[in-house]
């Protein structure tokens, strides 16, 4: 629970608690913003980001964004609050322990995004269908 000597200030989004009233500690995420990437046509890639950051707010999760256009491929790694859209998209998979890339519609480029909530989970980005729980065969295995 929140220690009694830690003041609760008004509108304080820096003190976040879970359902049991325990203080929620912040996530550690890879945070290199946008970098050029060689990740292409692979089942999974490492971010090659050497910066692990303490997310500023405890509710933030790790995010990775992979983009490919005619000129280059980039990978973006950040912390972000899942209550807020990122690149105009909702972070649907924020509670996932793994960063499973999902394609989003963006004109003029190929755009994949994932979010996750385990330490440095956006270091390993996964494109492979076998990890995607929208795959009915995988759901069958899970529920058997």
């Amino acid at each position: 629970t929140i220690p009694p000597h830690v003041q609760k200030s008004v509108n304080n989004d820096m003190i976040v608690t879970d359902n049991n009233g325990a203080v929620k500690f912040p996530q550690l995420c890879k945070f290199c913003d946008v970098r050029f990437s060689t990740c292409d046509n692979q089942k999974s890639c490492m971010s090659n980001c050497s910066i692990t950051s303490i997310c500023e707010k405890p509710q933030e999760v790790c995010v990775a964004v992979w983009r490919k256009n005619d000129e280059n491929i980039t990978l973006e790694t950040v912390c972000h609050d899942p209550k807020l859209p990122y690149h105009d998209f909702i972070l649907e998979d924020a509670a996932s322990p793994k960063c499973i890339m999902k394609e989003k519609k963006k004109p003029g480029e190929t755009f994949f995004m994932c979010s996750c909530s385990s330490d440095e989970c956006n270091d390993n980005i996964i494109f492979s269908e076998e990890y995607n729980t929208s795959n009915p065969d995988l759901l069958l295995v899970i529920f058997q």
Epitope: A22, V23, F25, L28, T52, I54
Partner: nanobody, 119 residues
Framework: EVQLLESGGGLVQPGGSLRLSCAAS???????RMWWVRQAPGKGLEWVS?????????YYADSVKGRFTISRDNSKNTLYLQMNSLRAEDTAVYYC????????????WGQGTLVTVSS
């Protein structure tokens, strides 16, 4: 009984240095991540720095990177925060905290030590 006892706070001039200590007892100190967290008057918690159980991996908030250094001595059950190039905005109560881990499911907090940076 679990205890985390911070010390080393005080009044320091801008540009000065302080070293905070946090003496731990009542739990397996080397198991899990430890944090320094601060709270400026009337503000929320700011997560300053963290260190893994073995001490090899350390993490810092952007606001203190390059100025603060976290370390731990597991043989002495003590966590440290070396604070250099202190600024007025570093004024706060500094808490050490142990994050819950798989082997230790509760988090623990110290009572805090006040750091005041003023000329």
């Amino acid at each position: 009984e679990v205890q985390l006892l911070e010390s080393g706070g005080g009044l320091v001039q801008p540009g000065g240095s302080l070293r905070l200590s946090c003496a731990a007892s009542g739990f397996t100190f080397g198991d899990g991540r430890m944090w320094w967290v601060r709270q400026a008057p009337g503000k929320g918690l700011e997560w300053v720095s963290a260190i893994e159980g073995a001490g090899s991996d350390t993490y810092y908030a952007d606001s203190v990177k390059g100025r603060f250094t976290i370390s731990r001595d597991n043989s002495k059950n003590t966590l440290y925060l070396q604070m250099n190039s202190l600024r007025a905005e570093d004024t706060a109560v500094y808490y050490c905290a142990k994050q819950a881990s798989r082997n230790s499911p509760f988090d623990y907090w110290g009572q805090g030590t006040l750091v005041t940076v003023s000329s």
